[in-house]
Interface confidence: medium
């Protein structure tokens, strides 16, 4: 029977407001609202916590019955949808001990684990997996790329009691390995032997100058020579212009610096490798994975452009159950969500096309009107000119 420590799907309307607590550490934290967003697979099931104000810090948390993951697997899972086409903002969660004062949660509150996507500009598009080990936040040594599209994605972290881990996105493994190898929790197992040093006669040169090679006698030629084809101009006046010197050109016989031919070094011993010894500082820690106490799940983020929706939170000790839960939530609505988005995009495209067409027609009609006005003006001008021509002889008669 799986142990479900925390599960939140926001299926009871405003009920979430009694389970989630806003931090009061800053007066201007952003507000979360319950929403399924502009597009969704199922309007009710896809409701989650949505960030609603741009350029804000967000700090909201929910507590649960404290537990320890000692001797068992820990699975943390949730969905994130950046429907605002996010440019900079966190989509991660933090797991805290139950000693956290939820009303004072902030960026420096000590957590156990931080996990989830983080995007900021073109440079940051990663899944954070950070463990607090002996009071220090230790980052994973691998770069795990997160999703940066507008759709809902399922993020899963599995931490096992054999000190191994797995990260899944959309129920597919994207990274796995051992905690010891992929984080710098412990000093290295091996270190360079401080008592060893490279012998003085150790030759690392693969090639050497051939001692039998010598420079040919005719090698040294100047790089530049006077142009033999240049002639002093006829109008050159030595008193006025000084002594004539022909321009210099590149010497075709110049061979550059002579270098002796290279041969294999008979004394070559290869690159000296510093011998390693067991690090006396190293001692294995079979309980890197373990925490005495988990009691709060928190959203402690910054977002430039708001609109991210968090949903389907799950903390359990059962990998299979988490996968199943993911398939029953995200898995069931993802296709319909994409369908709705595609439909909206198509409608938008048609609307824009229609607006473009209408605008062009209006412009053409205006141009046509202008042309007609212009033609009328021209006709008026011609009429006016004809009238004037007819008037002139009449005037002359009267004057006579």
């Amino acid at each position: 029977e799986p142990a479900v420590y925390f599960k939140e799907q926001f299926l009871d309307g405003d009920g979430w407001t009694s389970r989630w607590i806003e931090s009061k550490h800053k007066s201007d934290f952003g507000k979360f609202v319950l929403s399924s967003g502009k597009f969704y697979g199922d309007e009710e099931k896809d409701k989650g916590l949505q960030t609603s104000q741009d350029a804000r810090f967000y700090a909201l948390s929910a507590s649960f019955e404290p537990f320890s993951n000692k001797g068992q697997t820990l699975v943390v899972q949730f969905t994130v949808k950046h429907e605002q086409n996010i440019d900079c903002g966190g989509g991660y969660v933090k797991l805290f001990p139950n000693s956290l004062d939820q009303t004072d949660m902030h960026g420096d509150s000590e957590y156990n684990i931080m996990f989830g996507p983080d995007i900021c500009g073109p440079g940051t598009k990663k899944v954070h997996v950070i463990f607090n080990y002996k009071g220090k936040n230790v980052l994973i040594n691998k770069d795990i790329r997160c999703k940066d599209d507008e759709f809902t994605h399922l993020y899963t972290l599995i931490v096992r009691p054999d000190n191994t881990y797995e990260v899944k996105i959309d129920n597919s493994q994207v990274e796995s390995g051992s905690l010891e190898d992929d984080w710098d929790f412990l000093p290295p197992k091996k270190i360079k032997d401080p008592d060893a040093s490279k012998p003085e006669d150790w030759d690392e040169r693969a090639k050497i100058d051939d001692p039998t090679d010598s420079k040919p006698e005719d090698w040294d030629k100047p790089e530049h020579i006077p142009d033999p084809d240049a002639k002093k101009p006829e109008d050159w006046d030595e008193e006025m212009d000084g002594e004539w010197e022909p321009p210099v050109i590149q010497n075709p016989e110049y061979k550059g610096e002579w270098k002796p031919r290279q041969i294999d070094n008979p004394d070559y011993k290869g690159t000296w490798i510093h011998p390693e010894i067991d690090n006396p500082e190293y001692s294995p820690d079979p309980s890197i994975y373990a925490y005495d106490n988990f009691g709060v799940l928190g959203l402690d983020l910054w977002q430039v452009k708001s609109g991210t929706i968090f949903d389907n939170f799950l903390i359990t000790n059962d990998e299979a159950y988490a996968e199943e839960f993911g398939n029953e939530t995200w898995g069931v609505t993802k296709a319909a969500e994409k369908q709705m988005k595609d439909k909206q995009d198509e409608e938008q495209r048609l609307k824009e096309e229609e607006e473009d067409k209408k605008r062009k027609e209006e412009e053409e009609a205006e141009d046509k009107e202008d042309d007609e006005d212009k033609d009328e003006d021209e006709e008026d001008e011609e009429d006016k000119e004809e009238d004037e021509e007819e008037d002139v002889p009449g005037q002359a008669k009267d004057e006579l």
């Epitope: 810090f57 440019d87 900079c88 991660y92 960026g107 983080d118 900021c120 910054w302 430039v304």
Partner: nanobody, 116 residues
Framework: QVQLQESGGGLVQPGGSLRLSCTAS?????FGWYRQAPGKQREFVAN???????RYSDSVKGRFTISKDNAKNTAYLQMNILKPEDTAVYYC?????????????WGQGTQVTVSS
């Protein structure tokens, strides 16, 4: 600690232009411009990342241009074809990030009024 100093606001007629500038002390991951009209929420206008990517809100696209002078550590917002609805206090924002830690800093704001 990052200090931000904005300038360039003022009164301008509809269709006119203004250039806001924001000078920062310190190393910045992203510069942004936001605005707040009387009685309304602060809203995103434009931003620009160290890597060079730029984003604008739909309401200013094609009229406003954000740019940055790295040597002066200054961000600019060139505002053209201004409309009365652009009237607001404009705030410069600088984002400093480090591995999931975020610090954001705000300027004191500069008033832009578009009116005939």
């Amino acid at each position: 600690q990052v200090q931000l100093q904005e300038s360039g606001g003022g009164l301008v007629q509809p269709g006119g232009s203004l250039r806001l500038s924001c000078t920062a002390s310190g190393s910045i991951a992203a510069f942004g411009w936001y605005r707040q009209a009387p009685g309304k929420q602060r809203e995103f206008v434009a931003n620009m990342y160290v890597g060079g990517s730029i984003r604008y809100s739909d309401s200013v696209k094609g009229r406003f241009t954000i740019s940055k002078d790295n040597a002066k550590n200054t961000a600019y917002l060139q505002m053209n074809i201004l409309k009365p609805e652009d009237t607001a206090v404009y705030y410069c924002n600088a984002l400093v990030r480090f591995e999931g830690r975020n610090d954001d800093y705000w300027g004191q704001g500069t008033q832009v009024t578009v009116s005939s």
